[in-house]
């Protein structure tokens, strides 16, 4: 699987999950989140050659089409597969509230 | 929705479904499909700016991050959302067989 275990410990050139830290204030302009100040969101990057973790029958067809037509702009793209929530603390007035923000952290990628 | 109805009748620059015809023999090297000779597979293409048909909370965060960090390589990607099957005819010797190949045609796209 193109997950953090594999991708973070390899020098994989093809589609894989990459490390990305997002600072809520600096990178998103969000002032309402009190904790954490930022988080390891990660992102997906890398080419999707034929056979590389293809998501559907269509992805296989498109990757194969791309192999036969290397100049074509039609190609599968490396996108998130498994996403995890992020627990955050924000304030309503002086009262702290804990919330789970769903689908915030990329754990693995796929070619779609 | 970024579907064929909208995308094929517009000059949309952002993520949208685009027309692509695939010839089974020429583009994939498949000799075993008798009918059709090819099909309109379509593909997804175009940038994914903030708010543009974003798939998950993560996609929104990444698009916003990209807006704050325009030079970053981390950005959402335009990928298939709705896929449809394709009925095909292949031969087992002289005997024709009909099969549905699932997830073969792109009907709409999303930013993931």
């Amino acid at each position: 699987a193109l997950d953090t275990n594999y991708c973070f410990s390899s020098t994989e050139k093809n589609c894989c999950v990459r490390q990305l830290y997002i600072d809520f204030r600096k990178d998103l302009g969000w002032k309402w989140i009190h904790e954490p100040k930022g988080y390891h969101a990660n992102f997906c990057l890398g080419p999707c050659p034929y056979i590389w973790s293809l998501d559907t029958q269509y992805s296989k067809v498109l990757a194969l089409y791309n192999q036969h037509n290397p100049g074509a702009s039609a190609a599968p793209c490396c996108v998130p597969q498994a996403l995890e929530p992020l627990p955050i603390v924000y304030y309503v007035g002086r009262k702290p509230k804990v919330e789970q923000l769903s689908n915030m952290i990329v754990r693995s990628c796929k070619c779609s | 929705a970024l579907d064929t109805n909208y995308c094929f009748s517009s000059t949309e620059k952002n993520c949208c479904v685009r027309q692509l015809y695939i010839d089974f023999r020429k583009d994939l090297g498949w000799k075993w499909i008798h009918e059709p000779k090819g099909y309109h597979a379509n593909f997804c293409l175009g940038p994914c700016p903030y708010i543009w048909s974003l798939d998950t909370q993560y996609s929104k965060v990444l698009a916003l991050y990209n807006q704050h960090n325009p030079g970053a390589s981390a950005a959402p990607c335009c990928v298939p959302q709705a896929l449809e099957p394709l009925p095909i005819v292949y031969y087992v010797g002289r005997k024709p067989k009909v099969e549905q190949l699932s997830n073969m045609i792109v009907r709409s796209c999303k930013c993931s």
Partner: antibody, heavy 120, light 108 residues
Framework: QVQLVQSGAEVKKPGSSVKVSCKAS????????ISWVRQAPGQGLEWMGG????????NYAQRFKGRVTITADESTSTTYMELSSLRSEDTAVYYC?????????????WGQGTLVTVSS | ETVLTQSPGTLSLSPGERATLSCRAS???????LAWYQQKPGQAPRLLIY???SRAPGIPDRFSGSGSGTDFTLTISRLEPEDFAVYYC?????????FGQGTRLEIK
């Protein structure tokens, strides 16, 4: 160049199953159809079935239906043939072969063969 | 299923001679659903002819195939020492694919 490399010889007990692998290299596996053929010692050739790896459509000889399963793993360009409820008459060399492109077709490239011996 | 009968069972000839191998089908195969293979001891079969008369890549032109319907022939115009082997015909018109029982071509 095109190569089909099969797994090693197997000795099996009657009633058990065997799974033989066939790894393709040197060409686009995705455009292929793979057939499996066996040859009992000193005997002729017998077709068991075939698979279209990219869509996992398999076709079997009637006499093996229910006992043979042919599958493909595209990520490793490998095809598998599993034969269950083995009996002594299944002792044979098992070959994988790529066809000229159709489900039933002539077979242009062959694996080296895998000897399966069924004995108690 | 389609039964293929090869004749003769064994053919004894000398290098330089012409070999004619026959394959008869129990039902018509049309004109393009027959192949011929050569097999040597301990080796996998090697495709010689497909579509009844088309030579496979790399096969010398001394090998030729002919026939249609139920009667097919493999001809080796001038036998070379490496041609002595077992030859099989195969039909792929109908499932299951079937093979003939083989013709052994031996040195006289």
């Amino acid at each position: 160049q095109v190569q089909l490399v099969q797994s090693g010889a197997e000795v099996k007990k009657p009633g058990s199953s065997v799974k033989v692998s066939c790894k393709a290299s040197g060409y686009t596996f995705s455009s292929d159809v793979i057939s499996w053929v066996r040859q009992a010692p000193g005997q002729g050739l017998e077709w068991m079935g075939g698979v279209i790896p990219i869509v996992d459509i398999a076709n079997y000889a009637q006499r093996f239906k229910g006992r043979v399963t042919i599958t493909a793993d595209e990520s490793t360009s490998t095809t598998y043939m599993e034969l269950s409820s083995l009996r002594s008459e299944d002792t044979a060399v098992y070959y994988c072969a790529s066809t000229l492109g159709l489900v039933l077709d002539a077979m242009d490239y062959w694996g080296q063969g895998t000897l399966v011996t069924v004995s108690s | 299923e389609t039964v293929l009968t090869q004749s003769p069972g064994t053919l004894s000839l000398s290098p330089g001679e012409r070999a004619t191998l026959s394959c008869r089908a129990s039902q018509s195969l049309g004109s393009s659903y027959l192949a011929w293979y050569q097999q040597k001891p301990g080796q996998a079969p090697r495709l010689l002819i497909y579509g009844a008369s088309s030579r496979a890549p790399g096969i010398p032109d001394r090998f030729s195939g002919s026939g249609s319907g139920t009667d097919f022939t493999l001809t080796i115009s001038r036998l070379e020492p490496e041609d002595f082997a077992v030859y099989y015909c195969q039909q792929y018109a109908d499932s299951p694919i079937t093979f003939g029982q083989g013709t052994r071509l031996e040195i006289k």
